[in-house]
C-alpha cells in the first residue's frame, strides 16, 4: 500500500489511476467504507464522510484515467487508509498527517529556549531533524528543544519529518529579538560629540516597549541611569534624562543617543536595556566610551586615555615626520622637554589606529 505524508493545514493529492485513459466510474472511501466522493454521470458526488466538504477531484484529469482525490486544509485526524475503487479494482493509500508547531511565540529573546512539538497520528513513529538558518542540526522525536537561542538562529528553520522512508518538510520562521551587536566601543577625543547607535537585529510591524541606559563611569564608584525612554510603534520618546551629561535621543529607530562632548569623566561602559511589550526579559547591548586627551604643561607633553581599554592596546606619542616615539601598553604616556612640532597621540590595536589626537608644541625661547 502506498504511503503519503501530509502537513496539517496543507493540501494533498491522493492519486488513483485507471488503465483505460477514459472517464469511468470511480469512488473514494475511508477505512470504515464510508464514501467520500465519486462520480455520477459527469457530476462529482459527495458522500456522508466528515471529509466531504474538504475533498475534491479534478474533472479535467478524468479523461486521462486519473481519479485523484484532493483533500484541503488537512487535519491530523484525516490520517487514515483511503480506498479508491475504479475498474473493479481497489487501490489503497495510507495518509499520515503531521503538524509541527513552536510551543511558544516564534518571536523570542536571545538566550530564551525554543521548543518545537510534533503532532502525529496514533501508531506512527516519526523522527524529526531540524536545521537552523546558521546550519546547526538538531534531532528529536515528538519534541525538539533549542535551549539558548542566539542571534544567528533568526530566520527560517527547516524541519524534516520522516516516516516509512517518506519525508515531509516544515518551514518555521523564528525571530530572535536582539540588538545587532552584543557590545560596541566608541573612541573619541576630548570635546568631540559622541554618537551611540543601537540597531536591532529584527523588524516588527509594531514595536512598543521601554528602555534605559545605565552608565558606569571609570572614575565613579557606582553606576547611574543616564536616560530612560519609551518606544511606541517605532517612535521614541524620552521619559527622563540626567542633567550631566545631557544626552539627546533620536525620535526614530534605530535607537540613537548623542553625548554633546566626550569628557574624561564620562569615559566608561554602559548597558542599554530594552523591554518589549508582551515579552518577558530584556534585550541588552553593552557600549563603551574611550576618551583621549593630549596636553602640554610646562616641559611635559602627556597623552592619556580613559575608559575600558584592553591591555594589548598601545598608546604612543610621535613627532610628525621625525622618528621620535614613545610607546607603552598603558593608559598614559609622556615626553619630557618635547621637541617643537606637531605631535600625534595614537591609540592602536595591532597596528590599527583606533584614535588619534594632534597637539602642537611651540618652541620655548
Amino acid at each position: 500500500k502506498k504511503v503519503v505524508l501530509g502537513k496539517k493545514g496543507d493540501t494533498v493529492e491522493l492519486t488513483c489511476n485507471a488503465s483505460q485513459k477514459k472517464n469511468t466510474q470511480f469512488h473514494w472511501k475511508n477505512s470504515n467504507q464510508i464514501k467520500i466522493l465519486g462520480i455520477q454521470g459527469l457530476f462529482l458526488t459527495k458522500g456522508p464522510s466528515k471529509l466531504s466538504d474538504r475533498a475534491d477531484s479534478r474533472k479535467s484529469l478524468w479523461d486521462q484515467g486519473c481519479f485523484s482525490m484532493i483533500i484541503k486544509n488537512l487535519k491530523i485526524e484525516d490520517s487514515d487508509t483511503y480506498i479508491c475503487e475504479v475498474e473493479n479494482k481497489k487501490e489503497e493509500v495510507e495518509l499520515l498527517v503531521f503538524g509541527l508547531t513552536a510551543n511558544s511565540d516564534t518571536h523570542l529573546l536571545e538566550g530564551q529556549s525554543l521548543t518545537l512539538t510534533l503532532e502525529s497520528p496514533p501508531g506512527s513513529s516519526p523522527s524529526v531533524k531540524c536545521r537552523s538558518p546558521g546550519g546547526k542540526n538538531i534531532q528529536g522525536g515528538r519534541t525538539i528543544s533549542v535551549p539558548q537561542l542566539e542571534r544567528q538562529d533568526s530566520g527560517t528553520w527547516t524541519c524534516t519529518v520522516s516516516q516509512d522512508q517518506k519525508t515531509v518538510e516544515f518551514k518555521i520562521d523564528i525571530v530572535v529579538l536582539a540588538f545587532q551587536k552584543a557590545s560596541s566601543t566608541v573612541y573619541k577625543k576630548e570635546g568631540e560629540q559622541v554618537e551611540f547607535s543601537f540597531p536591532l537585529a529584527f523588524t516588527l510591524e509594531k514595536l512598543t516597549g521601554s528602555g534605559e541606559l545605565w552608565w558606569q563611569a571609570e572614575r565613579a564608584s557606582s553606576s547611574k541611569s543616564w536616560i530612560t525612554f519609551d518606544l511606541k510603534n517605532k517612535e521614541v520618546s524620552v521619559k527622563r534624562v540626567t542633567q550631566d551629561p545631557k544626552l539627546q535621543m533620536g525620535k526614530k529607530l534605530p535607537l540613537h543617543l548623542t553625548l554633546p562632548q566626550a569628557l574624561p569623566q564620562y569615559a566608561g561602559s554602559g548597558n542599554l536595556t530594552l523591554a518589549l511589550e508582551a515579552k518577558t526579559g530584556k534585550l541588552h547591548q553593552e557600549v563603551n566610551l574611550v576618551v583621549m586627551r593630549a596636553t602640554q604643561f610646562q616641559e611635559n607633553l602627556t597623552c592619556e586615555v580613559w575608559g575600558p581599554t584592553s591591555p594589548k592596546l598601545t598608546l604612543s606619542l610621535k613627532l610628525e615626520n621625525k622618528g621620535a616615539t614613545v610607546s607603552k601598553q598603558a593608559k598614559a604616556v609622556w615626553v619630557l622637554n618635547p621637541e617643537a612640532g606637531m605631535w600625534q597621540c595614537l591609540l592602536s590595536d595591532s597596528g590599527q589606529v583606533l584614535l588619534e589626537s594632534n597637539i602642537k608644541v611651540v618652541p620655548t625661547w
Epitope: L42, R58, K59
Partner: antibody, heavy 115, light 107 residues
Framework: QVQLQQWGAGLLKPSETLSLTCAVY????????WSWIRQPPGKGLEWIGE???????NYNPSLKSRVTISVVTSKNQFSLKLSSVTAADTAVYYC?????????WGQGTLVTVSS | DIQMTQSPSSVSASVGDRVTITCRAS??????LAWYQQKPGKAPKLLIY???SFQSGVPSRFSGSGSGTDFTLTISSLQPEDFATYFC?????????FGQGTKLEIK
C-alpha cells in the same frame, strides 16, 4: 492567505523567448496545480498550461509546441517560457492556482512584442 | 476544445437593476463551470464555482445556476462596484476555456 507574485521581461522582439516566474507565498504548494493564463489587450482569457509540484504538466494544444512550464518546489516557484514570440503574443500574462477553478491570481505582467 | 459563448457581449444597467448574463457550452459540462469578475487593470476574481457555489467573501446578490450546457449569472440588485467585465470558464476538460466576456456598463 495565499498570494502569487510574478515577474519577468515586459518588452520582447519577435522570435525571442518570453520568460516569466511566479512565486507562491503562504498556503500549500504541493497539493495544487499552478497555471498560466494570458489576455491580449481588450480581449478574452486564454489558458496556456499548468504544472504541479512534481513537474506534471498539461498544456493548451494551440500553444504546446512553443510552451515550457517548469517548477522549483524548494522555492515555491513556477515559470513560463514561450519561444518564437510574435506580435500576437502581446498580452497580460497571469499566474494562478488551480484545482478546477482559478483562484487566487497573480497581479499580471504586460508583455509587449514589438520590433 | 469546448467553446464557451457568453451573451450579451455588453449590457447597460443602472444601480439597483437585476442583471442576468448567460453562458453556453458547446457540449455537456455538467456543473463544471465558474464565473469571474474583472475590473480594468486588475486580475480576474472568482465569484461562483461548480455552477452555483459561492466563493467565500462574495456578496449574496451574485448567484449562479444551470447545468449541462446552459448557465446563468444573476446580480439581483446592481451596486456601483459591480460594473466590470464577467467571464465564464469550463473545467470539464483540457484545454480550460473561457467565454469572451460580458461588459457590464452604467446606463
Amino acid at each position: 492567505q495565499v498570494q502569487l507574485q510574478q515577474w519577468g521581461a515586459g518588452l520582447l522582439k519577435p522570435s525571442e523567448t518570453l520568460s516569466l516566474t511566479c512565486a507562491v507565498y503562504g498556503g500549500s504548494f504541493s497539493g495544487y496545480y499552478w497555471s498560466w493564463i494570458r489576455q491580449p489587450p481588450g480581449k478574452g482569457l486564454e489558458w496556456i498550461g499548468e504544472i504541479n509540484h512534481s513537474g506534471s504538466t498539461n498544456y493548451n494544444p494551440s500553444l504546446k509546441s512553443r510552451v515550457t512550464i517548469s517548477v522549483v518546489t524548494s522555492k515555491n516557484q513556477f515559470s513560463l517560457k514561450l519561444s518564437s514570440v510574435t506580435a500576437a503574443d502581446t498580452a497580460v500574462y497571469y499566474c494562478a492556482r488551480v484545482l478546477n477553478w482559478f483562484d487566487p491570481w497573480g497581479q499580471g505582467t504586460l508583455v509587449t512584442v514589438s520590433s | 476544445d469546448i467553446q464557451m459563448t457568453q451573451s450579451p457581449s455588453s449590457v447597460s444597467a443602472s444601480v439597483g437593476d437585476r442583471v442576468t448574463i448567460t453562458c453556453r457550452a458547446s457540449q455537456d459540462i455538467a456543473d463544471w463551470l465558474a464565473w469571474y469578475q474583472q475590473k480594468p487593470g486588475k486580475a480576474p476574481k472568482l465569484l461562483i464555482y461548480a455552477a452555483s457555489s459561492f466563493q467565500s467573501g462574495v456578496p449574496s446578490r451574485f448567484s449562479g445556476s444551470g447545468s449541462g450546457t446552459d448557465f446563468t449569472l444573476t446580480i439581483s440588485s446592481l451596486q456601483p462596484e459591480d460594473f466590470a467585465t464577467y467571464f465564464c470558464q469550463q473545467a470539464n476538460s483540457f484545454p480550460y476555456t473561457f467565454g469572451q466576456g460580458t461588459k457590464l456598463e452604467i446606463k
